[in-house]
């Protein structure tokens, strides 16, 4: 629970708690912002980001954004609040323990994004269809 000597709420800046009233600790995410990447045509890639950061807010999750255009490939790794859009997209998969890449429509580039909620989960980004629950065959297996 919240320790009694810690201020509970000031200036609407709440201390985030879980369902049991315990203070919610933030998670760890890879946090290198945007870096050039060699990840291409692979089922999964490591981020090659050497910075693991404590997220600023306990509600934040890990995010990875992979982008490819005519010039280069980049990989972005950050913490982000799933209640807020990122690159104009909602983080639909924020509760996932793994970072499963999903393609988003962006003109002039190939754009994939994933989010996840376990420590350093955006270090391993997964493109493979076998992990993608939008695959109807996989859904069939799950619900049988």
């Amino acid at each position: 629970t919240i320790p009694p000597h810690v201020q509970k709420s000031v200036n609407n800046d709440m201390i985030v708690t879980d369902n049991n009233g315990a203070v919610k600790f933030p998670q760890l995410c890879k946090f290198c912002d945007v870096r050039f990447s060699t990840c291409d045509n692979q089922k999964s890639c490591m981020s090659n980001c050497s910075i693991t950061s404590i997220c600023e807010k306990p509600q934040e999750v890990c995010v990875a954004v992979w982008r490819k255009n005519d010039e280069n490939i980049t990989l972005e790794t950050v913490c982000h609040d799933p209640k807020l859009p990122y690159h104009d997209f909602i983080l639909e998969d924020a509760a996932s323990p793994k970072c499963i890449m999903k393609e988003k429509k962006k003109p002039g580039e190939t754009f994939f994004m994933c989010s996840c909620s376990s420590d350093e989960c955006n270090d391993n980004i997964i493109f493979s269809e076998e992990y993608n629950t939008s695959n109807p065959d996989l859904l069939l297996v799950i619900f049988q």
Epitope: D18, N20, A22, V23, F25, L28, I54
Partner: nanobody, 122 residues
Framework: EVQLLESGGGLVQPGGSLRLSCAAS???????QMWWVRQAPGKGLEFIS?????????YYANSVRGRFTISRDNSKNTLYLQMNSLRAEDTAVYYC???????????????WGQGTLVTVSS
């Protein structure tokens, strides 16, 4: 009974240094994940550093990376935070906390010290 007692706070000029200590008792210190957490006046909690055990792997918030260093001395049951290049925005009450899984997935017990005040001002 678990006890965490912070010390080492005080008034320091911008650019200066301080070393905080957290004396732990009532549990096996060497096996626990430990944190430093701060609360600036009128703000929420900011979780600034974590050290794991075993292995002693360390993690930092972006706001303190490169300036603060967390460490532990398991033989003395003490957690430390070395704070260099201090800024006015580092003014806060600094708490040490320990966190241990309950055994139920995703839930934890946490324990907190009483805190030590650090004021950075000229």
């Amino acid at each position: 009974e678990v006890q965490l007692l912070e010390s080492g706070g005080g008034l320091v000029q911008p650019g200066g240094s301080l070393r905080l200590s957290c004396a732990a008792s009532g549990f096996t210190f060497g096996t626990e994940q430990m944190w430093w957490v701060r609360q600036a006046p009128g703000k929420g909690l900011e979780f600034i550093s974590r050290i794991d055990s075993p292995g002693g792997r360390t993690y930092y918030a972006n706001s303190v990376r490169g300036r603060f260093t967390i460490s532990r001395d398991n033989s003395k049951n003490t957690l430390y935070l070395q704070m260099n290049s201090l800024r006015a925005e580092d003014t806060a009450v600094y708490y040490c906390a320990k966190r241990r899984p309950t055994g139920v997935s995703g839930t934890f017990y946490d324990y907190w010290g009483q805190g030590t005040l650090v004021t950075v001002s000229s």
